[in-house]
């Protein structure tokens, strides 16, 4: 059973995820980014069902699209490099979703914009974070 | 980390059938469009035709269009791409390469001689 | 189909040197345009995509420019290992087609 601490260890590292896929969404939706236009052009896969940990299987998957998508962007538009930033957020998800068990992940036939993808995992990290609390 | 690994080099006579492998590994397979490039000794890049592993969809150029086949097995995660009616200029170095939308050819096999001689 | 013309299809350059290749599309492609660059044996290797987007590991003496139907590729300072040859690849519609190629050699 997980203890009080490995409890709360997930819940600020969801929180870290949550915020850094905020800061992606912040950045591209900046209304001084100019390829935001190319950018909305590209296909996310997105997950058939996104209520557990071991789900983040397909986040991890869509990590390198993004960072190559993200690439498009001014760097002033975030803090870090994308490749800086999906390196942090892959490290997170890693350990998020444990490496004990191997996932395969089902996408749902639909595919998102880049801002849907984004929003459809920040609602994931809300919604697994209130249940912890 | 991604690899693409293609089979090992094939002599064939005029008029026979050569398939060549590639196996993916280090990425999900029906995630990426497998691309095949060929390259004749001193000649440039030629784009033949891609698979979408996913759906099993495929688009060939026109100048192989009924003499190629792209197929996949999702299970072994391995893309195929099987040229018939072969003739002595279709010598050359076959590359299978990892495409999405936009983003160009992101990764490439070792490339597979072919070499068509009676 | 869209036919690509680079050029030049060869080039003489020294290590220091600022060197340009061009690639004209024979229709708008807007920004789907990549540059390879491939060395004697091996495969191709990625340079830029998008027309000016660089990918991970690739140094920034490499950069592209350009949309619609005119799109070059720049080394600021021509390093040893870049002496290769340079292909542009179209990837705005099927069939996708490639440059004929431009060969940089040591001067």
């Known amino acids: 059973a997980p203890t009080s601490s490995s409890t709360k260890k997930t819940q600020l590292q969801l929180e870290h995820l949550l915020l850094d896929l905020q800061m992606i969404l912040n950045g591209i939706n900046n209304y001084k980014n100019p390829k935001l236009t190319r950018m909305l052009t590209f296909k996310f896969y997105m997950p058939k069902k996104a209520t557990e940990l071991k789900h983040l299987q397909c986040l991890e998957e869509e990590l390198k699209p993004l960072e190559e998508v993200l690439n498009l962007a001014q760097s002033k538009n975030f803090h870090l490099r994308p490749r800086d930033l999906i390196s942090n957020i892959n490290v997170i998800v890693l350990e998020l979703k444990g490496s004990e068990t191997t996932f395969m992940c089902e996408y749902a036939d639909e595919t998102a914009t880049i801002v849907e993808f984004l929003n459809r995992w920040i609602t994931f990290c809300q919604s697994i974070i209130s249940t912890l609390t | 980390q991604v690899q693409l690994v293609q089979s090992g080099a094939e002599v064939k006579k005029p008029g026979a059938s050569v398939k060549v492998s590639c196996k993916a590994s280090?990425?999900?397979?029906?995630?990426?469009?497998i691309n095949w490039v060929r390259q004749a000794t001193g000649q440039g890049l030629e784009w033949m035709g891609w698979m979408n592993p996913n759906s099993g969809n495929t688009g060939y150029a026109q100048k192989f269009q009924g003499r190629v086949t792209m197929t996949r097995n999702t299970s072994i995660n391995t893309a195929y791409m099987e040229l018939s009616s072969l003739r002595s200029e279709d010598t050359a170095v076959y590359y299978c390469a990892r495409g999405r939308q936009w983003l160009g050819f992101d990764y490439w096999g070792q490339g597979t001689l072919v070499t068509v001689s009676s | 189909d869209i036919q690509m013309t680079q050029s030049p299809s060869s080039l003489s350059a020294s290590v220091g040197d600022r060197v340009t290749i061009t690639c004209r599309a024979s229709?708008?492609?807007?920004?789907?345009l990549g540059w390879y660059q491939q060395k004697p044996g091996k495969a191709p290797k990625r340079l830029i995509y998008?027309?000016?987007t660089l990918p991970s590991g690739v140094p920034s003496r490499f950069s592209g420019s350009g949309s619609g139907t005119e799109f070059t590729l720049t080394i600021s300072s021509l390093q040893p290992e870049d002496f290769a040859t340079y292909y542009c690849l179209q990837h705005n519609s099927f069939p996708r087609s490639f440059g004929q190629g431009t060969q940089l050699e040591i001067k």
């Open positions: 280090g990425y999900t397979f029906t995630n990426y469009d």
């Open positions: 229709q708008d492609i807007e920004h789907d």
């Open positions: 998008a027309a000016s």
